[in-house]
């Protein structure tokens, strides 16, 4: 640990004769550095150099050629290393009054004549005096104002809002201020910070805009972080509302953003009298150009039941927003003269939900749909395939005679998506038919038997079995069946030499 | 046509306020900025700040600040501008101007008062 | 606060001559940069925006150039009527600072 370095003249204050020169020595362990009242602009008669001495010590001298009012006020000297952006300077103080009497208060920047008062906090209007013996009194538009002078700070005490100036007299002649204005500012302990971000989605040459608001404080310094911050990219506003409650909004627009514009956008607020602090932060991603993506939740062929309610799902993500319309069999679907309805919402910024509504499956809801998302910059599409299941159902069993070879074809016509399944099955002994243990499965390998089956068009099927040789009376039943249903008929078969017919239905 | 036309020129004490109107015309007075310039004789052009015509809001410059007052009256789609302890050094004519765009980010005051020229003196 | 040195602060030239003022950022401030035309007596007319955008109704002679610190405005062909003080403006961050202007004589 270094001590704190020392100064030469070592007094707390020195008064400098006015046009005189002086110098100032500071000795430390490391090496030091001097802060003195004036800024880089005015400090031109001012000069700092390094001295070699044989005490090991590091000494460096401030050097004032010619002393004016301006150089009047607080000269410390620190260790290089301890100085730090945040901090009060750490180091060891001597003040110098250099008085004037054509200048009796120090001369200030602007503005240190805008002095911020926290709530009811205590204030200092800093009116300083270049010489520690002038009598100072200070005056609002009441008249003169009790308040504790110190010469090295100004006045300090809890301080209305509003105008004030400092009067002082020097030899007989009387001099005052501009107006010092004392401003109210609200602040809380907490921080009340709010991040807005109406888009995260961009894309080249749109303007980004990001916004934070702090609530109810007016002592606030905030920061942007952003990946354009390095190249000064980003314009920053702050706009204060004051109606109906106290509210800081702090803007950032980039306009013309580019892909490198993509990344995390954060806003830092600092209570500036207080150590508090509060953080928000937003990614913003930024696309060369829009973009659609489609993604059902549904496969490329799909079954609905006869009169069955469905609903096909499908999420699409995309940017600028899109147009999404949905056909059948490559035609607009005409909503109102169908039972099929379509909606979009929106589900997130960039998110989107469409559904395609069947109310009451019917046969000709079947065919080729497809839903279509298109921006200025993106179209995509995704098709599918529906097929609405009718369970099966026989239209027609009928047979026909061969003539004299006493050969016989019976034809079942049936119906159903999916196409139904054909089954045969026969009773040799007719007055035993109404047991079901008498029918058996009439088998393809049979000899004299010829069973077929042709398919009518996407729904129906025709199946055929042709007997050889009908000898005696049977019965013969057609089994039509699919996913959804079976229906079966019968018909009665008699011998040729019989001559007669019979359906037994 | 769209246009601003400010009140007419004053002469204030030092000490005393002055408050500056700009009536806006032919656009929407909510949809753009506000900013008040000024420019002392024979200087160059001074920012004192911008109101927020839809929420009342504004911006100051540092400059100004504790003195400066900008609000509007969005009935009768006028601005104001009030500054308060006037000293000599606030001579000047006091412009105000319309913000091209302000939330795209392409600045710029493309539509001005007529200016408004307040003489400090006592 | 941001300052803005316009140079040369005044200068004259013929009519037809190529006129170049340039304006220079104390900090990077991208594009972010507009151009005004005073006219002796009259208000300021803004000619340029985000460095090089010309806005409606401004004559074609005039262009902007520059990004970052260094800018430029360039009137390709002087006339009469472009005698005026032209003012360089930043918009990056608040306070709004002017530079200082050029005035623009003819020969």
């Known amino acids: 640990q270094l001590s704190l370095p020392s100064i030469l003249p070592n007094e707390n204050e020195k008064v400098v004769q006015l046009n005189s020169s002086f110098s100032l020595r500071c000795f430390g362990e490391s090496e030091v550095s001097w802060q003195y009242p004036m800024s880089e602009e005015e400090s031109s008669d001012v000069e700092i150099r390094n001295e070699e001495n044989n005490s090991g010590l590091f000494v460096t001298v401030l050097e004032v050629s010619s002393a004016s009012a301006a150089h009047t006020g607080l000269y410390t000297c620190y260790y290089n290393h301890t100085q730090t952006e945040e901090n009060e300077l750490e180091g060891r103080h001597i003040y110098i009054y250099v008085p004037d009497p054509d200048v009796a208060f120090v001369p200030l920047g602007m503005t240190d004549y805008l002095v911020i008062v926290e709530d009811d906090d205590s204030a200092i209007i800093p009116c300083r005096t270049t010489d520690p013996e002038t009598p100072v009194t200070l005056h609002n538009s009441e008249g003169v104002v009790p308040a504790s002078y110190d010469s090295r700070q100004g006045f300090n005490g809890t301080f209305t809002v509003g105008p004030y100036i400092c009067e002082a007299t020097v030899k007989g002649k009387k001099f005052q201020t501009i107006p010092f204005n004392v401003y109210a500012l609200k602040a809380t302990s907490e921080l009340d910070l709010e991040m807005e971000a109406l888009k995260t989605v961009y894309k080249s040459g749109e303007t980004i805009v990001v916004t934070c608001a702090v609530f109810n404080n007016e002592v606030v310094d905030l920061q942007w972080t952003y990946p354009g911050e390095v190249k000064g990219k980003g314009i920053t506003m702050l706009e204060e509302i004051k109606v109906p409650s106290i509210k800081l909004v702090y803007t950032l627009t980039v306009p013309e953003a580019t892909v490198k514009d993509s990344g995390d956008y954060e806003c830092a607020a600092r209570q500036a009298t207080r150590e508090v602090k509060e953080m928000k932060k937003v990614t913003i991603s930024v696309h060369e150009k829009g973009f659609i993506e489609i993604k059902p939740t549904f496969s490329q062929l799909e079954a609905v039941n006869l009169h069955e309610v469905k609903h096909f799902v499908v999420e699409v993500r995309a940017y600028p927003p899109p147009r999404i319309s949905w056909l059948k069999n490559n035609l607009t679907l005409i909503e109102n003269l169908t039972e099929i309805t379509t909606d979009v919402e929106k589900i997130q910024e960039i998110r989107y939900r469409s559904k395609l509504k069947l109310i009451r499956a019917k046969e000709e809801d079947s065919g080729h749909y497809t839903i279509v998302a298109q921006n200025e910059d993106a179209v995509k599409s995704y098709t599918f395939e529906l097929l609405t299941q009718v369970p099966s159902s026989i239209l027609d069993l009928v047979d026909d005679h061969h003539g004299s070879t006493g050969g016989q074809t019976v034809r079942c016509t049936a119906e159903g998506t999916p196409l139904p399944d054909i089954e045969w099955m026969i009773c040799k002994d007719i007055k035993k038919c109404n047991n079901e243990t008498s029918w058996t499965i009439l088998a393809n390998n049979v000899s004299n038997i010829i069973t077929e089956i042709h398919s009518r068009d996407r729904s129906t099927v025709e199946g055929r079995v042709t007997f050889a040789k009908v000898e005696e009376t049977i019965a013969v039943r057609c089994l039509a069946k699919n996913l959804l249903g079976a229906e079966n008929r019968e018909l009665k078969l008699v011998a040729p030499t019989l001559r007669s017919e019979l359906t037994v239905a | 046509q769209v246009q601003l036309v400010q009140s007419g020129a004053e002469v204030k004490k030092p000490g005393a306020s002055v408050k500056v109107s700009c009536k806006a015309s032919?656009?929407?007075?909510?949809?753009?900025?506000m900013h008040w310039v000024r420019q002392a004789p024979g200087q160059g052009l001074e920012w004192m700040g911008w109101?927020?015509?839809?929420?009342?809001?504004?911006n100051y410059a540092q400059k100004f600040q504790g003195r400066v007052t900008m609000t509007r009256d969005t009935s009768i789609s006028t601005a104001y501008m009030e500054l308060s302890r006037l000293r000599s050094d606030d001579t000047a004519v006091y412009y105000c101007?319309?913000?091209?765009?302000?939330?795209?980010?392409?600045?710029?005051?493309?539509?001005w008062g007529q200016g408004t020229t307040v003489t400090v003196s006592s | 606060d941001i300052q803005m040195t316009q140079s040369p602060s005044s200068l004259s030239a013929s009519v037809g001559d190529r006129v170049t003022i340039t304006c220079r950022a104390s900090?990077?401030?991208?594009?972010?940069l507009a151009w005004y035309q005073q006219k002796p007596g009259k208000v300021p007319k803004l000619l340029i925006y985000?460095?090089?955008t010309l806005q409606s109704g401004v004559p074609s002679r005039f262009s902007g150039s520059g990004s970052g610190t260094d800018f430029t405005l360039t009137i390709s062909s002087l006339q009469p009527e472009d005698v005026a003080t032209y003012y360089c403006?930043?918009?990056?961050?608040?306070?709004?600072?002017f530079g200082q202007g050029t005035k623009v004589e003819i020969k």
């Open positions: 101007a319309r913000d091209r765009a302000f939330w795209s980010g392409y600045h710029g005051l493309d539509v």
């Open positions: 032919g656009y929407t007075f909510t949809g753009y900025h």
């Open positions: 109101i927020n015509p839809n929420s009342g809001g504004t």
């Open positions: 900090q990077v401030i991208a594009n972010y």
């Open positions: 985000a460095a090089s």
């Open positions: 403006h930043t918009y990056k961050s608040a306070p709004w600072t």
